[in-house]
């Protein structure tokens, strides 16, 4: 088999026939050096998954539940291409599983016990697996058989396809539990009708159901959605209030050596030639000999899944939690209101050491998880492997786009009620050596630049955003002659100045000596012409305040700030000579962990915060000898956010807009993956 062949897995005679037709028609339109199709027939989707894992086939299209199976070890498959529905201009690759209630009913998600429930059908995704999976640990024990536990949880239900003899309560609202449209409460529209008629109190359906059944907005306004954080929202706010976001139909491949680019090349060309309304001879999204053969008949085309996206991220935390609960059936001993330990994400072994000391001192309240980059940490928080970390504003933006929320802000000024007063922010500045007297904001081209890291506020987003407005392109590595911007591509001129050894060169963590505020300033001291840092960086590393050999003899007077008007000012005049105001660093977490992270961190800062006077003999949460490990070293306290509890509100409209403008220059693979899930 030539290397450019994609071996498609078919699960029936009809699929195999369509696959052969697909193969033959592709041969007729694709040049001989292009991708080709071969067909492999297996007895089931699970057999196809195993065949792909064993390198006997390359691709198959799966529903969400099977994407989960495909991801589990030893299969380790990943999503590579998604089918989309609707229009090319507004492609829908996901649907939202929601819980719909009547507006005046007054209960929340955590008060569903004893209510009457309407389901699309037993074992179906939005109508059963997701809601029951998420409610699993609230069900009365024994939880097996599941139908009995569900019957005992709700006071009555309609769950079409259930066994009405063994579980009569599941058929109480629709006698007989018929498994077809003969049952008026079957399927999406049926479950909604069950709610509408007043038979049930809650209907588990998908987000489009209510729009398909009620054309009139005034009628829709009689209904609300139950959110997982025990609030309610209007039905059109399903993107912010759902049980899970579920991919409709996805092509999977091996994680390693999975031919993902080739599969995309094949399917992209296939949709060009044989997509919706393209050809009479062969139609990719049509099944004359059956239904949904190889691809869904209702699909309109394909979209490439971003490479950073593994199955866990693609399926989303809520969906994975629900399905894992149902499959594994494990719950904490006795669900209590006690907070579980907060799993803090530490960057590389430098932060890990501090985190482990914190963990030991916290006596079980804090646990530590490591990752090599901030983006890897954010991904771990998204999928539940970690719970929280403190982030620069640029990463608060990415985390927010990935569904995380800010929970506490670092405060840098001493005040009486520090914890109650989140600050306006700090200043992003451009520092130069006083001796380089001809250097101004207007003649930085061709100079050597030092950045905290790509994607960070003071070191990247603010200066590069301002620069972008001037040069109108993203080739910052051509603007500066060389530099150190940790997180840049290794072969970029913006890694040339970095000092990390071997694989650590230009890494966005403390293994790279020029990483972070202190690192960027050190880069200026030793090699660079300009450093983009925060207004406190120079005073914190001069006058003997940083005892490291490179810093111990530095003098603040030897450095100056570049002002945007082309002038220069002394370092202490940052208030009148800065690039922009930056939002303070903030702790982020998943929505479901918000309350516990808030509670535990406030306890922890009372034990180990700024009130600890001797940091040589005691653990201090906000100290790490200018290394800014876990938190910035100048943190005085972690402050409540009050109503600034979303990333947009926290960062502010101006900053969100600035980072949004830089999006076209973004190299963030995580941001690309998260905007695929939520454009």
């Amino acid at each position: 088999v030539p290397d450019k062949t994609v071996r498609w897995c078919a699960v029936s005679e009809h699929e195999a026939t369509k696959c052969q037709s697909f193969r033959d028609h592709m041969k007729s339109v694709i040049p001989s050096d292009g991708p080709s199709v071969a067909c492999v027939k297996k007895a089931s989707y699970l057999d196809c998954i195993r065949a792909i894992a064993a390198n006997e086939a390359d691709a198959v299209t799966l529903d969400a539940g099977l994407v989960y199976d495909a991801y589990l070890a030893p299969n380790n498959l990943k999503p590579v291409v998604a089918e989309f529905y609707g229009s090319k201009e507004d492609p829908q690759t996901f649907y939202y599983a929601v819980a719909v209630v009547k507006k005046d009913s007054g209960f929340q998600m955590n008060q569903l016990r004893g209510k009457k429930s309407c389901h699309t059908g037993l074992g179906r995704s939005a109508g059963w697996n997701i809601p029951i999976g998420l409610l699993y640990c609230d069900l009365p024990e024994p939880r097996k058989p599941l139908e009995k536990a569900v019957a005992n949880f709700f006071s009555g239900s309609c769950a079409p396809c259930a066994d009405g003899t063994d579980f009569p309560q599941l058929c109480q609202l629709c006698p007989g539990c018929g498994c077809s449209t003969l049952n008026q409460y079957f399927g999406y529209s049926g479950a909604f009708k069950c709610l509408k008629d007043g038979a049930g109190d809650v209907a588990f359906v998908k987000h489009s159901t209510i729009f398909e059944n009620l054309a009139n907005k005034a009628d829709r306004d009689q209904y609300e959605l139950l959110c997982l954080d025990n609030t309610r929202k209007p039905v059109d706010e399903y993107k912010d209030c759902h049980l899970a976001q579920v991919p409709s139909h996805t092509v999977v491949a091996r994680s390693m050596g999975g031919k993902e680019d080739l599969i995309w090349e094949l399917l992209n060309q296939a949709q060009e030639h044989f997509g919706k309304d393209k050809s009479k001879e062969f139609q990719l999204f049509s099944s004359p000999h059956g239904k949904d053969l190889l691809f869904k008949d209702s699909a309109h085309g394909f979209l490439k899944v971003p490479p950073r996206m593994d199955a866990k991220m693609y399926l989303g935390y809520e969906y994975v939690t629900a399905i894992r609960n149902l499959r594994e059936g494990t719950c904490p001993e006795a669900p209590t209101d006690e907070c579980k330990p907060v799993k803090w994400c530490a960057l590389s072994h430098h932060e890990r050491l501090k985190c482990d000391e914190w963990s030991v001192n916290s006596v079980g309240k804090i646990e530590c998880v490591s990752a090599e980059t901030t983006e890897d940490c954010i991904a771990k928080i998204m999928n539940g492997e970690a719970d929280a970390m403190s982030l620069d504003g640029g990463f608060v933006y990415i985390a927010g786009k990935c569904g995380l929320v800010p929970v506490l802000a670092e405060n840098y000024n001493k005040s009486d009620n520090c914890e109650d007063t989140p600050e306006a922010g700090y200043f992003a500045i451009a520092v130069v050596k006083k001796s380089a007297s001809d250097l101004t904001w207007d003649n930085l081209k061709g100079k050597k630049s030092c950045h905290t890291a790509v994607g960070r506020t003071a070191g990247w987003n603010i200066p590069m955003g301002l620069l972008y407005n001037k040069i109108n392109h993203c080739r910052f590595d051509e603007f500066f002659s060389e530099g150190c911007a940790p997180g840049s591509k290794k072969d970029s001129s913006l890694c040339k100045l970095c000092m990390g050894s071997g694989l650590n060169l230009c890494e966005p963590n403390n293994k790279e000596g020029y990483y972070g505020y202190t690192g960027a300033f050190r880069c200026l001291v030793e090699k660079g012409d300009v450093a983009f840092v925060k207004h406190q960086t120079v005073p914190q590393n001069t006058g003997g305040k940083n005892p490291d050999p490179w810093a111990k003899n530095l003098n603040e007077k030897d450095y100056e700030l570049l002002c945007l008007d082309g002038t220069r000012k002394p370092v202490e005049e940052y208030a009148n000579c800065h690039l922009a105001r930056a939002p303070n660093h903030a702790v982020v977490t998943r929505k479901d962990k918000e309350a516990c992270v808030h509670k535990i961190l406030r306890q922890q800062q009372h034990l180990f915060g700024s009130n600890v006077t001797d940091c040589s003999g005691n653990f201090c949460l906000f100290r790490s000898e200018t290394k800014d490990l876990l938190f910035r070293d100048d943190t005085v306290c972690l402050a409540k956010l009050h109503d600034r509890n979303t990333y947009e509100k926290y960062l502010g409209e101006e900053y969100v807009k600035a980072v949004g403008n830089l999006r076209k220059c973004s190299t963030s693979s995580l941001l690309e993956a998260c905007t695929f899930r939520r454009p």
Epitope: H350, V360, S616, G617, E625, K627
Partner: nanobody, 114 residues
Framework: QVQLVESGGGLVQAGGSLRLSCAAS????????MAWYRQAPGEQRELVAA???????TYADSVKGRFTVSRDNAKDTIDLQMNSLKPEDTGVYYC????????WGQGTQVTVSS
């Protein structure tokens, strides 16, 4: 600055024992937190065992009951006694400490063959 130097690594059969030692270049009495980490190929460094200056001990779940950490302020060492070794204990073992600054050793290789 404190230099940390690990010794005692080597190749051992599953079920066997090794004692790793970490010697500091100066007094460890000012170090609040001393720990042993290990790193398997392609994995993150993970905490194996640690001791605080107040005598609080902690162990990774995977080594509880098999490994013992002991700190000797007089000799300026921290040792890790490893018994009932398993192939999954294989990796580079690093000594680390926190005081006025953070300190790491260069590591010593431990290989447990089955």
């Amino acid at each position: 600055q404190v230099q940390l130097v690990e010794s005692g690594g080597g190749l051992v059969q599953a079920g066997g024992s090794l004692r790793l030692s970490c010697a500091a270049s100066r007094s460890i009495s000012t170090l609040r937190f001393m720990a042993w980490y290990r790193q398997a190929p392609g994995e993150q460094r993970e905490l194996v065992a640690a001791e605080t200056s107040a005598g609080r001990l902690t162990y990774a779940d995977s080594v509880k009951g098999r490994f013992t950490v002991s700190r000797d302020n007089a000799k300026d060492t921290i040792d890790l006694q490893m018994n009932s070794l398993k192939p999954e204990d294989t990796g580079v073992y690093y000594c680390a400490a926190r005081g006025l600054a953070d300190y790491w050793g260069q590591g010593t290789q431990v290989t447990v063959s089955s």
